[in-house]
């Protein structure tokens, strides 16, 4: 019972991860304009990793795609590359995890080929949330790079008398909401691990145990002599615990994602 | 089509109030920001605030903070502008303006004329 | 507050003759979001409210003749009367989109030569 729920729960996680990561992914708001600097701006700009956007104090929006693969910076293309890995990794994932999860009967499919199907897609969801995580990262390294660069050359006079305000970026909440996710994934995917052992099929149902001769000693270790001995694996990988009995009281709830303009 | 219609010409004594109303029709009300405008006898025009209908956000200029305030009614798809404390330079022709892209203000009321005298 | 200076302040023209008006802001107006200068050009001609002419510097609004023109960038723009007509007397104002408060110029005045 324990398993199947660690097992449910880190599939639920991580759908929930994977839906924040693709979440983060097609967000615009990865950059936004810093208003420290300039509070009273009445045109504000965001970016994104596959378009800029500028909202007016009108309330008009205008956003326009980076047409260009070759002119973006690498990095950029980096973190493109690093949440589309991340999420085709999390799909994958999902996908293996759902016929792996316990509550889900599946023709004659044996706990051994479910326990590994836990574990792979349990690294999946690993390597997904540490993908997410890294490109978030990158991002944000690169934001705080460019915005000490602008700092320091913040105002660049014409004779001291007009100013041009060099417009800064910040962290956007694309950044958090792909943090959050990735760890969500990640977390998730743990999760899946642990279900994994437990599902995986003991060597042994039962300890060694020692059989003593009346002449002289001889220690036996189930798994020896399996014909002689009937104590070795069993080879149905049947689970003495299971009972057979498989109850799919589980609801799994998938989120719905809104967007808000 | 689109057209803004404000009150009529106001006289008030100084330190008194005035509200004056722009009436939008012609479009969506919420869907366009209503900013106001004065225009005082030989000066340039001076931007005074404006409401998101929408919501209801409004922002000011700081020279007319805590003394002007700007509100709206979506049923009568109406916005109003009340100035407090009035002096005798605030004689002048006050508009409201409909706000499109750029921030600009394509279509304007045709103005109301605030006369402050004692 | 950015302070709009407008120059001259007043301009006699001959009817078909090139009008040119200058606008100058104390800071760029040029947003590096999407390239567009945030500043509007306006016609106001006696006891009626300004008339838009251009948005983002050099957009002319729908319905505004062809021979006005709006150009300029950063701190500097110019707004061109190709051939003044009679109905072209007014006076013109700038306008900072870019920045609250919104500033106006001071305005000038076009008059027929």
């Known amino acids: 019972m324990a398993v199947t729920a660690c097992q449910g729960l880190g599939f639920v996680v991580s759908l929930i991860g994977i839906a924040g990561i693709i979440a983060a992914t097609c967000m615009d708001q990865w950059s936004t304009q810093d208003l420290y600097n300039n509070p009273v701006t009445a045109v504000f700009n965001y970016q994104g990793l596959w378009r800029s956007c500028v909202r007016e104090s009108s309330g008009f929006t205008e956003c326009r795609g980076y047409f260009t693969l070759l002119g973006l910076p690498a990095m950029l293309q980096a973190v493109r590359a690093l949440m589309i890995v991340g999420i085709v990794l999390g799909a994958i994932g999902l996908l293996v995890s759902i016929f792996a999860l316990k509550c889900i009967r599946i023709g004659s499919m044996e706990d051994s080929a479910k326990a590994n199907m836990t574990l792979t897609s349990g690294i999946m969801f690993i390597v997904s949330g540490l993908c997410a995580i890294a490109g978030v990262s990158v991002f944000a390294n690169m934001l705080v790079t460019n915005f000490w660069m602008s700092t320091a050359n913040m105002y660049t006079g014409m004779g001291g008398m007009v100013q041009t305000v060099q417009t800064r970026y910040t962290f956007g909440a694309a950044l958090f909401v792909g943090w959050v996710a990735g760890g969500l994934t990640l977390i998730g995917g743990v999760m899946m691990c642990i279900a994994c052992r437990g599902l995986a099929p003991e060597e042994t149902n039962y300890k060694a145990v020692s059989y003593h001769a009346s002449g002289h000693s001889v220690a036996y270790k189930p798994g020896g002599f399996k014909a002689s001995t009937g104590f070795g694996s069993n080879t149905k990988n049947k689970k003495i615990y299971d009972g057979g009995a498989r109850t799919e009281d589980e609801v799994q709830s998938y989120p719905s994602k809104h967007d808000y303009v | 089509q689109v057209q803004l219609v404000q009150s009529g010409a106001e006289v008030k004594k100084p330190g008194a109030s005035v509200k004056v109303s722009c009436k939008a029709s012609g479009y969506t009300f919420t869907k366009y920001i209503i900013q106001w405008v004065r225009q005082a006898p030989g000066q340039r025009l001076e931007w005074m605030g404006y409401?998101?209908?929408?919501?209801?956000?409004?922002k000011y200029n700081e020279k007319f903070k805590g003394r002007v305030t700007i509100t709206r009614d979506t049923s009568a798809s109406t916005a109003y502008m009340e100035l407090s404390s009035l002096r005798s330079e605030d004689m002048a022709v006050y508009y409201c303006?409909?706000?499109?892209?750029?921030?600009?203000?394509?279509?304007w009321g045709q103005g109301t004329l605030v006369t402050v005298s004692s | 507050d950015i302070v709009m200076t407008q120059s001259p302040d007043s301009l006699a023209v001959s009817l078909g003759e090139r009008a040119t008006i200058n606008c100058k802001s104390s800071?760029?107006?040029?947003?590096?979001?999407?390239?567009?200068?945030?500043l509007t050009w306006y016609q106001q001609k006696p006891g009626q409210p300004p008339k838009l002419l251009i948005y983002?510097?050099?957009t002319r609004e729908s319905g505004v003749p062809d021979r006005f023109s709006g150009s300029g960038s950063g701190t500097d723009f110019t707004l061109t009367i190709s051939s003044l007509q009679a109905e072209d007397v007014a006076v013109y104002y700038c306008?900072?989109?870019?920045?609250?408060?919104?500033?106006f110029g001071g305005g000038t005045k076009v008059e027929i030569k």
């Open positions: 409401i998101n209908p929408y919501n209801d956000d409004t």
């Open positions: 306008q900072n989109d870019y920045s609250f408060p919104f500033t």
């Open positions: 303006a409909r706000t499109y892209y750029g921030n600009s203000f394509p279509n």
């Open positions: 983002w510097a050099s």
């Open positions: 800071q760029s107006l040029l947003n590096s979001g999407n390239q567009k200068n945030y």
